[in-house]
């Protein structure tokens, strides 16, 4: 058993049929010595008396809010949560496996630049009695500070018969050094509590590996005289690290109709302009990627050809 | 050229060669990006490699103030990785293809280090750790880790030279 936060404790249980469970001793936080009784949740049934209560925790029915009283007055609470371990593996029932970029990916994180700011998100089908708390650091043995905000519900989607909820959190490294080569990864830890079930999820990454620039901005077209060619120009996204002579991007420019199966024109460039062939009913799209490190491409920025 | 005396390097040549190094580092093992090597406990390897750190003056302001600190750090790293790529880790079994990008990568690391420090001038170099994996699978894992780490190192070096070529070239 360990303390998650004040008066909230996590009991780690091996979860299999007829498992013996864990013996837990609860102590009432009071100077009082006698006349103390214990109850669980809303029940008035007295579970025991005395300053300590010894219980055998085997299942979710044994978890919950234990309260010690004296003469009708509440002295203190202890909330017991369960953390299940099945076949040596901690349960992951609360969050959905996003399967990208690999199986057992519950947390996904992205950064728009090298400033040390990043966003992580996760998915669940649970809509109520759900809380998250997020901690992060750079490195684990001698951790350096990363400050995370509160996790918030950022999107709701309907998937077949199910509703899916996306939560996200923003974090900022306290003393970020955008130009340095990271040697220690960022660690992100998410505590998830659903009713009386506790789970924790972790992710470890370098900012450089989760970079995904915003799409290029201000796409403009200039038709070239006596030609089907068009000069397309764009700018670096506002959110990208500066100066751009140091933090450079490379770009992919594509002309395509509405369907992916349609014919297209495509060219890669380090410049912020390119000449392409425009067709009626087609769109010109541009996306960006770090020039020197193969992290994710941005989403496309598009303008119609006509 | 970035000689210990403090004259300027051939920024544009360094830029071209460092960008080539980036391409080669990813070509040498593009799939490295799909392996989560941190799960393999890499303290003994990648903790020993020289990293370009915050105080090394490789940020735009540091380069403007005095690029020598940064260039010396990059030079150290280039020599370190050049030695690693020439070591038993890469020359032993399972043997690499004669024409794999690792060969070009090795040569280009040497080429860039020579651009930064012509013969006859000496900067301190870091000792290369004695990493002698006994099993081919260990060697393979070590290669992945070294290349992964090299990808990060040459990305910073390429930014430094691109910025230098754009803003510090005479």
């Amino acid at each position: 058993i360990w303390e998650l936060k004040k008066d909230v404790y996590v009991v780690e249980l091996d979860w299999y049929p007829d498992a013996p469970g864990e013996m837990v001793v609860l102590t009432c936080d009071t100077p009082e010595e006698d006349g103390i009784t214990w109850t669980l949740d809303q029940s008035s049934e007295v579970l025991g008396s005395g300053k300590t209560l010894t219980i055998q925790v085997k299942e979710f029915g044994d978890a919950g809010q234990y309260t010690c009283h004296k003469g009708g007055e509440v002295l203190s609470h202890s909330l017991l949560l369960l953390h299940k371990k099945e076949d040596g593996i901690w349960s992951t029932d609360i969050l959905k496996d996003q399967k990208e970029p690999k199986n057992k990916t519950f947390l996904r994180c992205e950064a728009k630049n090298y400033s040390g700011r990043f966003t992580c998100w996760w998915l669940t089908t649970i809509s109520t009695d759900l809380t998250f708390s997020v901690k992060s650091s750079r490195g684990s043995s001698d951790p350096q500070g990363v400050t995370c905000g509160a996790a918030t519900l950022s999107a709701e989607r309907v998937r077949g018969d199910n509703k899916e909820y996306e939560y996200s959190v923003e974090c900022q490294e306290d003393s970020a050094c955008p130009a340095a080569e990271e040697s220690l990864p960022i660690e992100v830890m998410v505590d998830a509590v659903h009713k009386l079930k506790y789970e924790n999820y972790t992710s470890s990454f370098f900012i450089r590996d989760i970079i995904k620039p915003d799409p290029p901005k201000n796409l403009q077209l200039k038709p070239l005289k006596n030609s089907r060619q068009v000069e397309v120009s764009w700018e670096y996204p506002d959110t990208w690290s500066t100066p751009h002579s140091y933090f450079s991007l490379t770009f992919c420019v594509q002309v395509q109709g509405k369907s992916k199966r349609e014919k297209k024109d495509r060219v890669f460039t380090d410049k912020t302009s390119a000449t392409v062939i425009c067709r009626k009913n087609a769109s010109i799209s541009v996306r960006a990627q770090d020039r020197y490190y193969s992290s994710s491409w941005s989403e496309w920025a598009s303008v119609p050809c006509s | 050229r970035a000689v210990p005396g403090g004259s300027s390097p051939a920024w544009t040549q360094c830029q071209q060669l460092s960008q080539k190094l980036c391409t080669l580092a990813w070509s040498a093992h593009p799939l490295v990006g799909h392996m989560d090597l941190r799960e393999e406990g890499d303290e003994e390897t990648t903790n020993d490699v020289p990293h370009i750190q915050c105080g090394d003056g490789c940020d735009p302001q540091g380069l403007r103030d005095n690029s020598q600190f940064c260039l010396q750090r990059i030079h150290q790293g280039l020599i370190f990785y050049e030695k690693l790529l020439g070591s038993d880790i890469f020359t032993g079994e399972p043997s690499l293809l004669p024409d794999s990008p690792v060969g070009q990568l090795h040569a280009s690391l040497l080429g860039l280090s020579q651009l930064l420090q012509p013969e006859g001038h000496h900067w301190e170099t870091q000792q290369i750790p004695s990493l002698s994996p006994s099993q081919p699978w260990q060697r393979l894992l070590l290669r992945f880790k070294i290349l992964r780490s090299l990808q990060a190192f040459v990305a910073v070096a390429a930014r430094v030279f691109a910025h230098g070529a754009a803003t510090l070239s005479p």
């Epitope: 297209k264 495509r266 067709r279 | -």
Partner: antibody, heavy 118, light 107 residues
Framework: EVQLQQSGADLVRSGASIKLSCTAS????????MHWVKQRPEQGLEWIGW????????EYAPKFQGKATMTADTSSNTAYLQLSSLTSEDTAVYYC???????????WGAGTTVTVSS | DIVLTQSPATLSVTPGDSVSLSCRAS??????LHWYQQKSHESPRLLIK???QSISGIPSRFSGYGSGTDFTLSINSVETEDFGRYFC?????????FGAGTKLELK
């Protein structure tokens, strides 16, 4: 199966013109760009130009402007290359090519050998 | 026009050898470079697009890398069916241009 059938070899007199054909099967040429590429004996490849059969748009390499004319007939699923004022320099194999992506050459015809005699 | 220089002009190899063919552009072309194989009396066929992207149906022994001005086509363990000419082609700007080719022949 995507295939391109090119017209047979031709021997033509210097100064004359010739029209080569390239008929597609297994796909509709409207959905592709059609290119023509020249290869002289024991030489490299030279790009002549492309046509978008959907709208008749064309783009020529400067070297072939005035020498080559590309057309396409979507009803017969055929692309054509006309070469005018032929000289011995035009003796070559001419390949037609169909591609979904404009700037590289995906599906090649077997080529038509054109020999210009004086 | 962008000029592509291929080297060597001829490469004599034994089946089982691994080889690298080089293509150098007269100016930076990012990764807008493609590789073709042409066997004797046949049409060319696309091997690699955009410097390193593989083409379905092409054996995995063919790989490409490079960006900017220097590009390489590697053939890991040459097979007898690989003999012929190899061309690079740039698509960075019009007109599209090809290299003069490298002839891969039996030693």
């Amino acid at each position: 199966e995507v295939q391109l059938q090119q017209s047979g070899a031709d021997l033509v007199r210097s100064g004359a013109s010739i029209k080569l054909s390239c008929t597609a099967s297994g796909f509709n040429i409207k959905d592709y760009y059609m290119h023509w590429v020249k290869q002289r004996p024991e030489q490299g490849l030279e790009w002549i130009g492309w046509i978008d059969p959907e709208n008749g748009d064309t783009e020529y390499a400067p070297k072939f402007q005035g020498k080559a004319t590309m057309t396409a007939d979507t009803s017969s699923n055929t692309a054509y290359l006309q070469l005018s004022s032929l000289t011995s320099e035009d003796t070559a194999v001419y390949y037609c090519n169909a591609t979904k992506e404009l700037r590289y050459f995906d599906v090649w015809g077997a080529g038509t050998t054109v020999t210009v005699s004086s | 026009d962008i000029v592509l220089t291929q080297s060597p002009a001829t490469l004599s190899v034994t089946p089982g050898d691994s080889v690298s063919l080089s293509c150098r552009a007269s100016q930076s072309i990012s990764i807008n470079l493609h590789w073709y194989q042409q066997k004797s009396h046949e049409s060319p066929r696309l091997l690699i697009k955009f410097a390193s992207q593989s083409i379905s149906g092409i054996p995995s022994r063919f790989s490409g890398y490079g960006s900017g001005t220097d590009f390489t086509l590697s053939i890991n363990s040459v097979e007898t069916e690989d003999f012929g000419r190899y061309f690079c082609q740039q698509s960075n700007s019009w007109p599209l241009t090809f290299g003069a080719g490298t002839k891969l022949e039996l030693k």
